[in-house]
């Protein structure tokens, strides 16, 4: 009785269960009752990452420097090349097909998380007591200056974009 289903790592072809090709190899010829499945290794620039019956290997991804990409991990016969972005850039998608410059956090916002090759800068508003007066992809919100520790008094209140302005104490009041 011909099989209607096959075991794991097998496939059904012409009423026969044949072994799938292992990762890193492509199918050359289906099995017969007398012969095992014929598989061939993928060439140097190709890969297959699953047990398969593909007759062609997939081409390794090309990390195009013109798009700001560079190789993070070289592909093997079983894995694709992993691209990442050059310094100052990050991927536009999970598959990392192109790169864009990291976002800068505007004045009033500080860097919560510095960008990586695969993720953009995360900014956060400076809370009360902190400020940022620059547009930056690295700078966090800085705390207002503590006038008291310098034996000074606040002459101008700080904002999320400006530091407090300290000045000398009024001696006449003393």
């Amino acid at each position: 009785e011909p099989p209607t289903a096959c075991r794991e790592k097998q496939y059904l072809i012409n009423s026969q269960c044949c072994s799938l090709c292992q990762p890193g190899q492509k199918l050359v010829s289906d099995c017969t009752e007398f012969t095992e499945t014929e598989c061939l290794p993928c060439s140097e620039s190709e890969f297959l990452d699953t047990w398969n019956r593909e007759t062609r290997c997939h081409q390794h991804k090309y990390c195009d420097p013109n798009l700001g990409l560079q190789v993070q991990q070289k592909g093997t016969s079983e894995t694709d090349t992993i691209c990442t972005c050059e310094e100052g850039l990050h991927c536009t998608s999970e598959s990392c097909e192109s790169c864009v410059p990291h976002r800068s956090c505007l004045p009033g916002f500080g860097v919560k998380q510095i960008a990586t090759g695969v993720s953009d800068t995360i900014c956060e508003p400076c809370p009360v007591g902190f400020f940022s007066n620059v547009s930056s992809a690295f700078e966090k919100c800085r705390p207002w200056t503590s006038c008291e520790t310098k034996d000074l008094v606040v002459q101008q209140a700080g904002t999320n974009k400006t530091d407090v302005v300290c000045g000398p104490q009024d001696r006449q009041r003393a």
């Epitope: 012409n14 010829s29 289906d30 099995c31 017969t32 009752e33 007398f34 012969t35 095992e36």
Partner: antibody
Framework: QVQLVESGGGVVQPGRSLRLSCAAS????????MHWVRQAPGKGLEWVAV????????YYADSVKGRFTISRDNSKNTLYLQMNSLRAEDTAVYYC??????????WGQGTMVTVSS | EIVLTQSPGTLSLSPGERATLSCRAS???????LAWYQQKPGQAPRLLIY???SRANGIPDRFSGSGSGTDFTLTISRLEPEDFAVYYC??????????FGGGTKVEIK
């Protein structure tokens, strides 16, 4: 390169025995089923026997059943055909051929067996 | 057992002409597992076509196969001098036995 080379042919008297060999090279012999096919002088091709890659399954043409035995030694990359009780009608060129789902894709050059008194 | 009948027995043609060879099976060939082989005098057969219509590695595209079920055809679009030989069809699905047709000889006219 992928190659099959038969040997062991010759002239033999009716009723006697002969063993043919087929040496394989250039491919993973132990993964392939193998066939013997023969061709009588001036005639067409006649399939003789097949053996599975691990040697467990064997089939024979009715004309040789009970007289011929196909076997293999995967450690030596060699296929055999033991021919007993030979008859004049067994006179032929004997070819070994590789089994695939594409048919018999590689053939040896053949070895001549002549059964004559 | 499937019987394969090839026709014509002999085909006399000139180089450059088209050759059409027929192979008829006594019952349907499973999965179109039908092959065509070429054999020149003193040489072993060579696989030309498998699966009724797929060319084997290194076979020129002037050779083509067609058909399914019980009727199969090998066509040589323009005969080259090296194509004059005997051609066999073979069913390699319905065994045992594996069967060959009686052959068609393509000779120079």
């Amino acid at each position: 390169q992928v190659q099959l080379v038969e040997s062991g042919g010759g002239v033999v008297q009716p009723g006697r025995s002969l063993r043919l060999s087929c040496a394989a090279s250039g491919f993973t012999f132990e993964k392939y089923g193998m066939h013997w096919v023969r061709q009588a002088p001036g005639k067409g091709l006649e399939w003789v026997a097949v053996i599975s890659y691990e040697g467990e399954k064997k089939y024979y043409a009715d004309s040789v059943k009970g007289r011929f035995t196909i076997s293999r030694d995967n450690s030596k990359n060699t296929l055999y055909l033991q021919m007993n009780s030979l008859r004049a009608e067994d006179t032929a060129v004997y070819y070994c051929a590789r089994d695939t789902s594409r048919g018999h894709d590689i053939w040896g050059q053949g070895t001549m067996v002549t059964v004559s008194s | 057992e499937i019987v394969l009948t090839q026709s014509p027995g002999t085909l006399s043609l000139s180089p450059g002409e088209r050759a059409t060879l027929s192979c008829r099976a006594s019952q349907s060939v499973s999965y179109s597992y039908l092959a065509w082989y070429q054999q020149k005098p003193g040489q072993a057969p060579r696989l030309l076509i498998y699966g009724a219509s797929s060319r084997a590695n290194g076979i020129p595209d002037r050779f083509s196969g067609s058909g399914s079920g019980t009727d199969f055809t090998l066509t040589i679009s323009r005969l080259e001098p090296e194509d004059f030989a005997v051609y066999y069809c073979s069913d390699y699905a319905d065994y045992p036995p594996f069967t060959f047709g009686g052959g068609t000889k393509v000779e120079i006219k």
